[in-house]
Interface confidence: low
Amino acid sequence: KESCDVQLYIKRQSEHSILAGDPFELECPVKYCANRPHVTWCKLNGTTCVKLEDRQTSWKEEKNISFFILHFEPVLPNDNGSYRCSANFQSNLIESHSTTLYVTDVKSASERPSKDEMASRPWLLYR
């Protein structure tokens, strides 16, 4: 019998390189049974994760899994950083691994920024 615990399937150390100015959807894959849990997104700021309360989110339901989506419309330079989704289910809080967005300039979309570039272009730095 399959477990009915809620599970969040963000891979450890997952990353996305995304283009500033484009729309983007950050997906949190959620597995649950009968009752869909309450899921939220937060953005890491040092050791704390700041809840993203005023952001557009939506659910996408598929046959064996659901996705809780954080919408970036469009991506801005300071969206750079690490995000985590968490689910409240039967008084339990389940947290995902963090996923990191690398926001890249139109001019360097084909390459991940080097440490030198990140030092010279502050908006690429983790905030």
């Epitope: 500033a20 939506s58 801005l76 330079p77 300071n78 300039d105 001019k107 272009r121 908006w123």
Partner: antibody, heavy 116, light 107 residues
């Protein structure tokens, strides 16, 4: 040629509401956010907010929350901004603009005059 | 909110001159800055984005520079059609904000 065509000038009384339109042509309406700006004489531009026509999601400048409501009609490729409880402070030229966060394409502007 | 300060409300120039319009951000915005030109009765026109990238079709006498908090729009060999208002805008974070504008006029 990408174009944003705004509705004509409006003269309205204090306390009333007004709805300004911005019709898009030349590109797929649902591909880009539509932003709205306010400009008063001898003053700079203020960003009001945007709507993403693909799903109707919006983001507002806190200063304009409760004042402006942004909507979009995909069938006519038109974005709308409704301004309510109008006062003389709302008298301005309002622009719609497109192409994400820096604005390649602008409407011609709609002049709103609030006067009794 | 990030405040974009254009310290000169007016700048006087002559045809053929070189003029620099400055803009200062209240906090680090990286290179997420655009410059616009606006003539009376018209909507603004994008000149520069990412602080220094000239929009296609904009004459190469318009040059943008800067990063962090200090930005400059330089117009070399000023032409009469360049007499207009110039605004900077940051798009590093919401709300998007604009400078108050600098009006370029003839001496």
């Amino acid at each position: 040629q990408d174009q944003l065509q705004q509705s004509d000038a409006e003269l309205v009384k204090p306390g009333a509401s007004v709805k300004i339109s911005c019709k898009v042509s030349g590109y797929t309406f649902t591909d880009h956010t539509i932003h709205w700006m306010k400009q008063r004489p001898e003053q700079g531009l203020e960003w009001i907010g945007y709507i993403y026509p693909r799903d109707g999601s919006t983001k507002y400048n806190e200063k304009f929350k409760g004042k402006a409501t942004l909507t979009a009609d995909k069938s006519s490729s038109t974005a709308y901004m409704q301004l309510n409880s109008l006062t003389s402070e709302d008298s301005a030229v309002y622009f719609c603009a497109s192409s994400n966060w820096n604005f390649d394409y602008w409407g011609q502007g709609t002049t709103l005059t609030v006067s009794s | 909110d990030i405040v974009m300060t254009q310290s000169h409300k007016f700048m006087s120039t002559s045809v053929g001159d070189r003029v620099s319009i400055t803009c200062k951000a209240s906090q680090d915005v990286g290179t997420a800055v655009a410059w616009y030109q606006q003539k009376p009765g018209q909507s603004p026109k994008l000149l520069i984005y990412w602080a220094s990238t000239r929009r296609t079709g904009v004459p190469d006498r318009f040059t943008g520079s800067g990063s962090g908090t200090d930005f400059t729009l330089t117009i070399s060999n000023v032409q009469s059609e360049d007499l207009a208002d110039y605004f900077c805008q940051q798009y590093s974070s919401y709300p998007l904000t604009f400078g108050a504008g600098t009006k370029l006029e003839l001496k």
